[in-house]
Interface confidence: low
């Protein structure tokens, strides 16, 4: 019989008392075969973290800073359940740390040196740890003691709780640095008042502070937020302009064998029986013998943290960077304006080989990082292990939801001004064999389908979005008799046609022979009835253009397109017979890397782009024998985006809406994790 006990870790007598009460009350409402609570008392949160890692306890609730400690080796814990605040309809599990300034003050994030700063309090997250952590490498040396370095960076500060004797500059704006609301500039509202009164130039607070202190929009409009990319935004755009996004209070467990499903089952039942306004005799979110015992008193309930989310992703790149800077105190030798090498994310073996060749040719400008799936690459870019990659529009959508930004677009048409004119996009088409003359868009049910990969634009999002509107359910594996859609569950009928061997079967990378545009077309040639690809796929792989044995004798005339009106047309008539226009593939990166990725890639394409005539003896960035490695092989150049520099603007309203509708059918664990951070 599996052990269904969750050993909760308590850090004080009062917590242990509440834990025992929790245990006893859960026993009274949960059947004997359901989850139960046992209580383990430790002296501190760090002791609890160690106990969970050592399998002496299973769960504890932690603030963000401790979630970071819990994640570090050798603890390796992960977030499993988040407390939420606000309403069930609009649950808040995170807050945003922001830098607020007056509208007319005219400086940016990289010009804070010599300004006057207002902090909520020394050592507090939004008011100190995050801004100072992010500014750490700009502080004057020596950076220890930290308070001295901060005092020398700003021209005056109010940092409540600082030692006014040793660091008088930190108390210049609030003599004494009082550590309670008796200091008028203490806490969130105090730090904002410090800015409002004109004592300081910038206030480090959380996003809600300005709304709580200024009910009037006209008053709020006198303030702006400083963004990390050295721009400013209105205060209500905090989701796109913040220093870090911070989880409020989180239950952690072991990464392996951590009972995360059991913990969720327990807490979900607990909130049903003893959550807000549920029970008089025991309340989960109330602490009669103290404050915030086991859980925050202000919490309204729990949400399950998506399983794909590790602590790094949960805490977010900015927060982890800030805390790591503060803890480790390491900075590059001398900060220069030079861009560091761009770490390109390569998918599996074939892309890595091409990337390594690029790296050698780039003389240190490009480095390579490997991952097995596109989603793993996106996650690596998010957490700073990698910097950039080129993505199909469907993954640009996921990357955008995960906070990444498009920086350059692949262009596929030769033009005089290629780099300055991003194209409107390519066409997503449905290709069939001319010989299957009875097949139309309206009678695809029960046929064999070939897809580039799950989540990709032409191969999945567009055709499945259209199909979803028709069938109103997500059981595409029932609609088609079988198929190959790399990235599907291995036991799905949509993996049955795939050709990869062993563990590589149906994998969304080049180890699966039917992956990507060329792979999906090959699937049609060899096994399928319909392939969902781009308009250039058929001509690129017929007429001897693809020398591979399966393709070298193919003829474009043997294939036709399915039109949405139920008719069919020759392949060259794609402009009048397509499923939708798809946005071109685009390079994505983190916001903080945008400028450097842009600069280095433009240099790289001038050296290795389509102006290189002989790819047999030279490295060509946009060539890989029709395998679309790193970039699509038909890329002519990487083009500037101009003002289409967010994923919504880049993909366009129509496509974002189409993918949004398909979200109901999404099997993307990464998308689930990222929409948890930003619904």
């Amino acid at each position: 019989v599996p052990d269904k006990t969750v050993r909760w870790c308590a850090v004080s007598e009062h917590e242990a008392t509440k834990c025992q009460s929790f245990r006893d009350h859960m026993k009274s409402v949960i059947p004997s075969d359901g989850p139960s609570v046992a209580c383990v008392k430790k002296a501190s949160y760090l002791d609890c973290i160690r106990a969970i890692a050592a399998n002496e306890a299973d769960a504890v609730t932690l603030d963000a800073g401790l979630v970071y400690d819990a994640y570090l080796a050798p603890n390796n814990l992960k977030p499993v359940v988040a407390e939420f605040y606000g309403s069930k309809e609009d649950p808040q599990t995170f807050y945003y740390a922001v830098a607020v300034v007056k509208k007319d003050s005219g400086f940016q994030m990289n010009q804070l040196r010599g300004k006057k700063s207002c902090h909520t309090g020394l050592g507090r997250s939004a008011g100190w740890n995050i801004p100072i952590g992010l500014l750490y490498c700009d502080l004057p040396e020596p950076r220890k003691p930290l308070e001295k370095a901060v005092a020398n960076f700003f021209s005056g500060s109010c940092a409540p709780c600082a030692d006014g004797t040793d660091f008088p500059q930190l108390c210049q704006l609030c003599p004494g640095c009082g550590c309670s609301t008796l200091n008028q500039y203490f806490g969130y509202s105090g730090a904002f008042k410090c800015l409002k009164d004109g004592a300081g130039d910038v206030a480090f607070v959380k996003h809600s502070t300005i709304f709580e202190n200024l009910a009037n929009k006209a008053d709020r409009d006198q303030y702006e937020l400083l963004c990390l990319d050295n721009t400013r935004k209105p205060v209500d755009e905090y989701k796109d302009c913040h220093l870090a996004q911070v989880p409020s209070h989180t239950v952690v467990a072991r990464s392996m064998g951590g009972k995360e499903d059991l913990i969720w089952e327990l807490l979900n039942q607990a909130q049903e029986h003893f959550g807000k306004d549920k029970s008089k005799e025991f309340q989960l979110f109330s602490s009669p013998h103290g404050k915030d015992l086991l859980f925050k008193d202000s919490a309204h309930g729990f949400l399950k943290v998506p399983p794909r989310m590790d602590a790094k992703m949960y805490l977010g790149y900015e927060y982890v960077t800030a805390i790591r800077n503060l803890r480790e105190g390491t900075c590059p030798e001398a900060p220069t304006d030079e861009c560091k090498p761009v770490k390109w994310c390569a998918l599996s073996h074939h892309e890595r080989l091409k990337c390594d060749e690029w790296s050698v040719n780039s003389v240190g400008k490009i480095e390579c990082v490997s991952a097995e799936t596109t989603e793993d690459c996106i996650a690596k870019i998010m957490n700073g292990e990698a910097d950039a990659m080129s993505l199909d529009g469907g993954f640009v959508y996921i990357a955008g939801k995960c906070g990444l930004v498009p920086v350059l677009a692949e262009n596929y048409n030769k033009s005089d001004n290629c780099e300055d004119t991003p194209e409107a996009g390519y066409f997503a088409i449905a290709v069939v064999k001319k010989s299957a003359s009875d097949l139309t868009w309206d009678n695809l049910k029960g046929k064999k389908s070939c897809h580039t990969a799950v989540g990709r634009t032409a191969g999945w999002n567009i055709p499945m979005g259209l199909l979803y509107n028709k069938i109103n359910h997500c059981r595409f594996d029932e609609f088609f008799s079988e198929g190959c859609a790399p990235g599907s569950k291995k036991d799905s009928s949509l993996c049955k046609l795939c050709m990869g061997s062993g563990l590589n079967l149906c994998e969304p990378n080049n180890k699966e022979g039917y992956y990507g545009y060329t792979g999906a077309f090959r699937c049609l040639v060899e096994k399928g009835d319909v392939a969902f690809v781009k308009h250039q796929t058929v001509p690129q792989n017929t007429g001897g253009k693809n020398p591979d044995p399966w393709a070298k004798n193919l003829n474009e005339k043997d294939y036709e397109l399915l039109c949405l009106d139920g008719t069919r047309k020759p392949v060259e008539e794609y402009a009048n017979c397509h499923l939708a226009r798809a946005p071109n593939h685009a390079v994505v990166t983190r916001k903080d890397k945008e400028a450097c990725v842009h600069k280095i890639l433009r240099q790289q394409q001038h050296l290795f782009g389509s102006n290189v005539t002989d790819c047999s003896g030279n490295f060509c960035l946009f060539r890989s024998e029709t395998k679309d490695l790193l970039f699509r092989d038909d890329t002519v150049c990487l083009a500037k985006l101009h003002d289409r520099n967010t994923y919504e603007k880049y993909l366009g309203e129509e496509y974002v809406k189409a993918v949004g509708n398909l979200r109901k059918c999404s099997t993307s664990s990464l998308l689930e994790a990222c929409t948890f951070r930003r619904p």
């Epitope: 409540p160 709780c161 600082a162 030692d163 006014g164 004797t165 108390c171 003599p175 004494g176 640095c177 009082g178 550590c179 309670s180 609301t181 008796l182 200091n183 008028q184 969130y188 509202s189 809600s208 502070t209 709580e212 202190n213 404050k291 202000s298």
Partner: antibody, heavy 120, light 112 residues
Framework: EVQLQESGPDLVKPSQSLSLTCTVT?????????WHWIRQFPENKLEWLGY???????NYSPSLKSRFSITRDTSKNQFFLQLNSVTTEDTATYYC?????????????WGQGTTVTVSS | IELTQSPSSLAVSVGEKVTMTCKSS????????????LAWYQQKPGQSPKLLIY???TRESGVPDRFTGSGSGTDFTLTISSVKAEDLSVYYC?????????FGSGTKLEIK
Amino acid sequence: EVQLQESGPDLVKPSQSLSLTCTVTGYSITSGYSWHWIRQFPENKLEWLGYIHSSGATNYSPSLKSRFSITRDTSKNQFFLQLNSVTTEDTATYYCARDGYSPPYAMDYWGQGTTVTVSS
Amino acid sequence: IELTQSPSSLAVSVGEKVTMTCKSSQSLLYSTNQKNYLAWYQQKPGQSPKLLIYWASTRESGVPDRFTGSGSGTDFTLTISSVKAEDLSVYYCQQYYSYPPTFGSGTKLEIK
């Protein structure tokens, strides 16, 4: 149990400085909380003067800032009030108190008070 | 912030209910935590003030439940449900919302 006890002169001449001591027992003043001085005038009006936090940070009433300071001697677990250039207006009973944090920022422990008369 | 207490004094018999008010010149409700930053103290003759109520309505431990604090924003009330002889005191309200903290002028409770 936490106890606070004020001590100092009963009588001070105008223009002189007033120094008072608060001795705390049952709790270390460096372990936490803020430690305050409050005074009560003969007509019973209460006035907050300032505090010293366990970290050593101080905060004073704006009306007295220029002639008022609070210091401490951690080895003796004492904190001190110094009021310069006193006038007859400073005649009052002076209390030291602790601000509780729980309950936050309200004074949960007070000394018995020491009465100071400013007169020539 | 100015706190105005009324009445300045009142005389009641043992067992009676007493209500006294404290009016603030600005709101003491902090929207972040929905708490009112107001405390009530009792000062018996010849003694130092004693904390009765904080957060406008939370009784300090050991304070009899006949003492109740209520109100929000700018208007606050201290109620003694059934006065006892030992309740003879001056009662002060104090705000700790804004720097510097300030006290009301007090309400003197006398026993008839």
